[in-house]
């Protein structure tokens, strides 16, 4: 706490300007009017205040706005934002994209801090949902943002926002997250034609079910091996050799290099060796010819 002292004669600040950098902490506290500071917040960033002086300015704003700062002040916090705690930020109501951009700019180049995470949370709550413009902005500053959300949080993302997602934004997403995002992407891109649709949906296919992969195999999509290796194992296993061949097109040759890795390894174990041989890739480990294949999961379901 800064002790309350009277402002010395002639020291009362008529405006926020560079002369204030020569004020001691107690002089700032006594001589700068909090309401003046709030209306001229945009000037603070241009003045080289010390961290200690910024602490005083923050204290003045906290006193003026005990329930949380208004957004007109928040938008111009600049480097003072770095002094805010998540508890401070939880009191804010933030709805403007320009406010969000201004504060993310302050933190640019650093990892997402607890302050930024709280700010984003307040913003999404203020706007009503994680909309396309917000997602555009957040992924520009933090490419891994989408994959930092839980499946529950992702479930509130509207399909229209998926248009803002770039392939690199999904690099660190795990299967549970893609399970949530894939149906949204399918809905978002449903009106596109075959080849355009595949380009857009490709990054999300780690959440695709078997029936959708079967449908894609009928569309000459030529899926690359990198995408195939990210598919859900349970979605790949029921695919026939012919369907995988159609799905991968010329990339089918890449299966040989991946035969010891999931999901290729597990898929090979489910195929008849006769069928695998038709690929001419020398894939081994299929069900030997003459063996009867029992689908035990089907048997259990019937009993």
């Amino acid at each position: 706490e800064v002790e309350k002292t009277a402002c010395p004669s002639g020291k009362k600040a008529p405006e926020i300007d560079e002369s204030l950098i020569f004020y001691k902490k107690w002089e700032l506290e006594a001589c700068v009017d909090a309401a003046l500071l709030a209306t001229q917040m945009d000037r603070v960033n241009a003045i080289p205040f010390t961290y200690e002086q910024l602490d005083v300015l923050k204290h003045k704003l906290d006193e003026l706005y005990p329930q949380g700062y208004p957004e007109s002040v928040i938008q111009h916090l600049g480097y003072l934002f770095l002094k805010m705690s998540p508890e401070d930020i939880r009191k804010w109501n933030v709805t403007s994209l320009e406010t969000l951009k201004a504060l993310l700019e302050v933190n640019k180049g650093h990892e997402m801090s607890p302050q930024v995470a709280t700010l984003i949370d307040r913003f999404v709550k203020g706007r009503g949902q994680l909309d396309k413009d917000t997602l555009d902005t957040l992924t520009a500053f933090y490419p891994g943002y989408l994959c930092s959300l839980s499946p529950e949080e992702l479930s509130s993302v509207p399909p229209s926002s998926i248009w803002a997602v770039r392939p690199q934004d999904l690099d660190t997403c795990d299967p549970r997250q893609l399970d949530v995002l894939y149906p949204k992407a399918r809905l978002a891109f449903q009106n596109m034609n075959g080849s355009e649709y595949f380009v857009k949906i490709q990054s999300f296919l780690g959440g695709a079910p078997t029936e959708d992969l079967k449908a894609l195999s009928q569309q000459n999509v030529s899926m690359d091996l990198a995408t195939f290796m990210k598919l859900r194992t349970d979605a790949v296993l029921p695919l026939t050799v012919a369907e995988v061949q159609k799905l991968l097109g010329p990339h089918v040759e890449g299966l040989k290099a991946e035969e010891r890795h999931r999901p290729v390894r597990d898929w090979i174990l489910r195929q008849r060796q006769d069928d695998l041989d038709t690929l001419g890739l020398g894939l081994q480990g299929g069900i030997p010819n003459g063996y009867l294949v029992l689908d035990l999961s089907m048997q259990e379901a019937l009993s």
């Epitope: 320009e98 201004a102 203020g126 909309d131 396309k132 413009d133």
Partner: antibody, heavy 119, light 110 residues
Amino acid sequence: QEQLVESGGGLVQPGASLTLTCTASGIDFSRYYMCWVRQAPGKGLEGIACIYIGGSGSTYYASWAKGRFTISKASSTTVTLQMTSLTAADTATYFCARGTNLNYIFRLWGPGTLVTVSS
Amino acid sequence: DVVMTQTPSPVSAAVGGTVTIKCQASQSINNGLAWYQQKPGQPPRLLIYSASNLESGVPSRFKGSGSGTEFTLTISDLECDDAATYYCQCIWDGNSYVNAFGGGTEVVVR
């Protein structure tokens, strides 16, 4: 007295280009959204583009307007809207409107300028 | 882009009566909604912002309510001067909201 006035409207041929100007007076122009909104005869309001004056200078466009319309700040008191490849469907009264520093709440509007695209 | 859908149009009521205009957003916008009144040959006039806040100088007969995706403008004690077209608009900034006006509702006062 805060005021916005649009200019540059008139009769143009299909395929032509046109630049509209919004001039502000009595306004602190430093922290506002300035937007263009149009209204075809007997129809509703249709937002075109917005620019954030001060700070980032960000521009935002309606999806239908991207590519053919360009909003820019020409001076401290004027904002322009460049329109290209005009068709009869662009015939409308074009309004400029001032938002706040936070959003598109339009408290101040210009009287509008009529653009007629016809051969 | 967010799509704003207004109903009904036109709506008719007698002087002294009440009219209710509804506006629906295609996605949740919390309280990010404004209402405007427009008369022929004039630019729109702001009535309500942030869903329920009355703009300075606007009579208290105008009342806005709602949140999320469903919003309502109620005009009570209707006067002849209230005959106009009313528009709702999502006020958030960003590309998705530049063209976020409802189609308009004409109010006819008998």
